[in-house]
């Protein structure tokens, strides 16, 4: 039965003499005469078990004292730890010449463990041990004792186990304490590593290669490695284990997040608080749930706060100049924390008498610079119909509106467009020509722009060229021309007039009177 | 058993020589050294000195020099203390001892009865 | 030579009593010493030596403690027999004995 001794931990002890109770039994030649199992007290009053001799007085002095069969558990170099006490023969009187001051320490390696006998011959000497000035002055209880301590260590061993063995050559000695120990680069965690326990190698220069195992929540960056050292202590890490995502280091493992923290990635980070406007519910996050209202767009870090859509443009102006209007805007004051804000357009064509029956305005409508995507604060718009409502709603937008598109975000103006003259006439006839008159008949404009208040029709002969022209007002979308010459070519224009002034001229219309009476209904092509 | 044997009391007159046996039995004579001790009457314990019985080297304490004789024949396992030129002073028990070395300290483990020499003219 | 003086020269005691018994060094000392009973008309007895070791025999109702300069033998509990002359002996090169200590029935 063995008490319960602290050691280093890259020691793990094979045989110790101070943790045995009772008595040792050791094995001693001759059986009498020689090393003694004697009981000394501790400062517990406690006993120790030692084993002295004193035999100085008789010269070639050969006692011997073997262990129990101690196993090697596979420690391929043990060291033996011996604390001892060594009278001075000088503090014995008389004995000169047969006192020595040293004694000498053997092993033998064997399979068996229930050897009875010691066979000198069979033992190979490890060393001679001398008591050295470094010994301590150790207390028992209010009793001073000397205490020497020597380690020595043996190697490489191949078999089960082994015997050691001390021989007195004539020394007043008593054996205090036998320690036999291996040493190992005891179970460690570096880098985020496990390195399992490892037994030192055979020889004292020796290094052993192990590999480390990621801890829990980790996995590798690069092959973590390590060598044991034959004095076991760890040396040269190579590699690392990083902790996941949603774990960090701690104490050389890998704990969760704690709620309200969160880790992305695997890498050597430490957990971070969740960005504004964000949280988590459960350890070990990776991300951080957005706030209800708070979003987060699909090209955004993790580490990045939640944002919102903006809140509406501010000071938003109108100005109208005929069928154009420029728009400008302010700002939103809450850019819902983003730089990525831009503004869309929309634009709505409403009914003079329900001005809540509107519908897009179409593809008609251009603008300047642009109608989505605006960076900057001001917009032109241009060929609108005159005398028109039309609301412009400026949409603030940013990386996250698409999520919770809302009508807070926009701001809208309601405008209606001013007289303008009247687009040109697209098609004239002549639908009756004569040999002194034309009947003309053509369409309204495609963009009265107002109330058309007449048409004005321009004619003139062809050879005359424009020189010397005619005018004649109706306000209906026909008229006959009369007191033309026979067999002479006219070419005719007609323009609308509205309270905004004339529209563009119509392309000309060339028709050549006829010598006899006859009907021609011409189709805006040349009659003749 | 381990023991030691001394010879009865000696009665001698001043100037005269004595030599005091102490036979051992139980153990090897040699492993251990003998020790003297003498005892005056009513007085305490004097120690004389020892000797090596294994090399017969003596070792003799302050003021028991001179006068003072230890020997051996290892052959009858015996150590002898011979006192020369006896004075009134030497009148004492004189006990002979077998000494206990230990690393940790020494001591008589096994005494002989004594042998009480008187000096009387 | 190291000088060793005991005190008290007399100790009275009642069987059962526990008795303590000084051994004072002229110097310091690195071993402790021996203790011997002696009782009339007999040859001086080891009690005690080395550290604090019992003699063969030797019942531990005695036990000896101290060091430097300062020793002690103590009897738990005193038996009748126990009633005797007690020695200190300090051992190295010259072994010296202290003048001793009379132990009697109270």
């Known amino acids: 039965v063995t008490g319960s001794r602290v050691y280093p931990a890259n020691e793990v002890t094979l045989l110790d003499s101070r943790s045995v109770q009772g008595e040792l039994g050791w094995i001693a030649s001759p059986l009498e005469g020689g090393w003694e199992e004697v009981s000394i007290m501790d400062e517990k009053n406690t006993p120790i078990r030692t084993y002295q001799v004193c035999n100085v007085m008789e010269a070639s002095q050969n006692n011997w004292l073997r262990t129990d069969w101690i196993t090697r558990e596979g420690a391929q170099r043990v060291y033996i730890e011996i604390k001892f006490t060594l009278r001075d023969c000088n503090s014995l009187p008389g004995v000169m010449g047969t006192c020595k001051e040293t004694f000498n320490l053997y092993y033998y390696e064997s399979d068996n463990d229930k050897e009875r006998f010691i066979r000198e011959s069979q033992f190979g000497k490890i060393d001679t041990i001398a008591a050295d000035e470094s010994f301590t002055q150790v207390d028992i209880g209010d009793r001073i004792m000397k205490l020497n301590t020597e380690i020595r260590d043996v190697g490489p061993l191949s078999k089960k186990g082994f015997y050691l063995a001390f021989q007195d050559v004539g020394a007043c000695i008593a054996l205090v304490s036998v320690r036999v120990f291996y040493k190992k680069c005891p179970l460690t965690v570096r880098n985020l590593a496990q390195f399992p326990d490892t037994i030192t190698g055979a020889d004292t220069s020796s290094l052993v290669e192990v590999r480390g195992s990621c801890v829990n929540n980790s996995e590798e960056k690069d092959v973590p490695k390590m060598y044991c050292g034959a004095d076991g202590e760890w040396l040269v890490p190579i590699g690392n284990c990083l902790c996941n995502a949603g774990h960090e280091e701690q104490n050389g493992e890998c704990q969760a997040c704690k709620i309200g923290y969160y880790k992305a990635l695997s890498t050597d980070a430490s957990c971070a608080k969740c960005p504004p406007h964000s949280y988590s519910v459960w350890e070990g996050a990776t991300s951080c749930t957005c706030d209800r209202g708070f979003f987060r767009a699909d090209n955004d870090a993790a580490s990045m706060p939640c944002t919102r859509p903006p809140s509406a443009p501010l000071n938003l102006i109108s100005n109208v100049n005929e069928t154009s209007v420029n728009l400008e805007w302010s700002s939103p004051q809450n850019t819902g924390g983003r730089q990525d804000i831009s503004y869309n357009v929309v634009c709505k064509k409403c009914g003079a008498g329900d001005p809540s029956k509107c519908r897009p305005c179409g593809s008609g409508v251009h603008y300047t610079p642009q109608q989505n995507g605006l960076k900057t604060t001001r917009v032109s718009i241009t060929d609108l119909l005159a005398h028109t409502n039309y609301t412009f709603e400026i949409w603030a937008v940013n990386g996250v509106s698409k999520y919770n598109p809302s009508p807070d975000q926009s701001v809208s103006v309601t405008v209606t467009t001013n007289q303008a003259a009247p687009s040109s006439i697209a098609l004239v006839q002549a639908k009756e020509v004569t040999r002194y008159s034309v009947a003309l008949a053509w369409l309204e404009p495609d963009r009265p722009n107002g109330v058309i208040l007449e048409y004005e029709v321009k004619y003139y002969e062809k050879d005359q060229n424009e020189r010397s022209y005619r005018i004649v007002r109706t306000a209906a979308r026909n008229t006959d021309i009369k007191g033309l010459n026979p067999l002479t070519s006219y070419v005719f224009h007609v323009r609308a007039r509205t309270a905004a002034g004339y529209g563009d001229f119509s392309e000309p219309l060339e028709v050549t009177t006829n010598t006899v009476p006859s009907r021609i209904i011409g189709d805006g092509a040349n009659s003749t | 058993q381990v023991q030691l044997l001394q010879s009865g009391a000696e009665v001698k007159k001043p100037g005269a020589s004595v030599k005091v046996p102490c036979k051992a039995s139980?153990?090897?004579?040699?492993?251990?050294?003998m020790s003297w001790v003498r005892q005056a009457p009513g007085q305490g314990l004097e120690w004389m000195g020892w000797i090596n019985t294994n090399t017969g080297n003596p070792t003799y304490a302050q003021g028991f020099t001179g006068r003072f004789v230890f020997s051996l024949d290892t052959s009858v396992s015996t150590a002898y203390l011979q006192i020369s030129s006896l004075k009134a002073e030497d009148t004492a028990v004189y006990y002979c001892?077998?000494?206990?070395?230990?690393?940790?300290?020494?001591?008589?483990?096994?005494w002989g009865q004594g042998t009480l020499v008187t000096v009387s003219s | 030579e190291i000088v060793l003086t005991q005190s008290p020269a007399t100790l009275s005691v009642s069987p059962g009593e526990r008795a303590t018994l000084s051994c004072r060094a002229s110097?310091?000392?690195?071993?402790?010493p021996a203790w011997y009973q002696q009782k009339p008309g007999q040859a001086p007895r080891l009690l005690i030596y080395?550290?604090?070791t019992r003699a063969t025999g030797i019942p531990d109702r005695f036990s000896a403690s101290g060091s430097g300069t300062d020793f002690t033998l103590t009897i738990s509990r005193v038996e009748p027999e126990d009633f005797a002359v007690y020695y200190c002996q300090q051992y190295g090169p010259s072994w010296t004995f202290g003048q001793g200590t009379k132990v009697e029935i109270k």
């Open positions: 001892a077998r000494v206990r070395l230990t690393v940790y300290g020494d001591g008589m483990d096994v």
């Open positions: 080395g550290l604090s």
């Open positions: 110097q310091s000392v690195s071993s402790n």
């Open positions: 139980g153990y090897t004579f040699t492993s251990r050294a």
